[in-house]
Interface confidence: low
Amino acid sequence: EVEKTACPSGKKAPEIDESLIFYKKWELEACVDAALLATQMDRVNAIPFTYEQLDVLKHKLDELYPQGYPESVIQHLGYLFLKMSPEDIRKWNVTSLETLKALLEVNKGHEMSPQVATLIDRFVKGRGQLDKDTLDTLTAFYPGYLCSLSPEELSSVPPSSIWAVRPQDLDTCDPRQLDVLYPKARLAFQNMNGSEYFVKIQSFLGGAPTEDLKALSQQNVSMDLATFMKLRTDAVLPLTVAEVQKLLGPHVEGLKAEERHRPVRDWILRQRQDDLDTLGLGLQG
């Protein structure tokens, strides 16, 4: 903690400006009014304070707002956000998407820090659900965000938010997560026509049950091998040779290259050799 000392004569800061970078830590503590700092937080970012000086400014705000900063201050924290601890952030009530964007911008290009994770958690809990605009924002900054959530957390995602999800946002999701997301996606895209529906649902199919894959096989969708390889093994196993052939369209010819990998390997072992032979791919059950 910085020791309390009187501000030298003529040093009292009338506003937050560049002259403050020449202040020693104790002078900043003594000569900058916390309320003034709170109202002029937007200026702090434009001034090249040292990390030690930022520590002092944070301390002043902590004293002014022991129960947590108001959103008007949080929105303009800028680089001072990097000085916050998860414990500090847990005291905040962030409701504005603009505030969230401003703070995520500060951390842009870096991996998700504990501070950012806490901020997002507070924000989403404050909203009650992961709505489309929030998801749009979070996946723009952190493409892997969705897959970092637990299946329980994903259950709070409303189907309407699924429209914000891009294929790359699901790259690192495991089957348990896709099990939760797939039914939501199915609901979200239910009014689309066949080919458009398939384009949208494709990334989520790792959570699809057998009956949905059977239905897709009747719709001339031409699923590529990369998508097929991500399907649940238990969902693929009951499919007949004819259904897989219809499901993959021209890509059925690529099964040969994947015959030693799951789920293709396990599916092949479940089929009658006579049926496999009809594919003309030399697959051995």
Partner: antibody, heavy 120, light 107 residues
Amino acid sequence: QVQLQQPGTELVKPGASVKLSCKASGYTFTSYWMHWVKQRPGQGLEWIGNINPSNGGTNYNEKIKNKATLTVDKSSSTAYMQLSSLTSEDSAVYYCARWNYYGNYPFDYWGQGTTLTVSS
Amino acid sequence: DIVMTQSQKFMSTTVGDRVSITCKASQNVGTAVAWYQQKPGQSPKLLIYSASNRYTGVPDRFTGSGSGTDFTLTISNMQSEDLADYFCQQYSSYPLTFGAGTKLELK
């Protein structure tokens, strides 16, 4: 080595039918699907359809579905395409091409093409 | 049907040039795109498959790139034997479709 042999030319009258052949050698005929492609003089390539030589299963381009019929004779390792109700629009070079799913390549071997001329 | 558009029907080039031929798909085809070379009186020859993989025996001056809807075939050091028609093809879904072709000519 892999070869797909096609007759050089066919001359037929409008309204007639013709059966083009494609004899495969140098590989296991039933292990690779055979596709047929049309090319009109100075034009691009148009996919007609494909056939699975193992069981005769086919896929056709819907635009020209009623024009072509694909068949195979496994005993002679030959693929056939019958074209019916011929008009001058059907005058073109017709290629057979093998699809190699083992390496997930598309058409790795093509026949030399049969030039079909429809004229009275 | 997926339309493959090769906007340049002809391209003039000289030996040693770097030539880029483009192809645009009307919808997302991932990387299921091949490039073929065709010389007069001959059948097409496979150059590139899966958008960027060079087929066996194809000189390394030929490279493919792109995914989704935009694809490019690049010849880094144009040779006289490369004068030919070049076609792109999608094999993402039936019916398989080809571009109209780009003819490389000498300036």
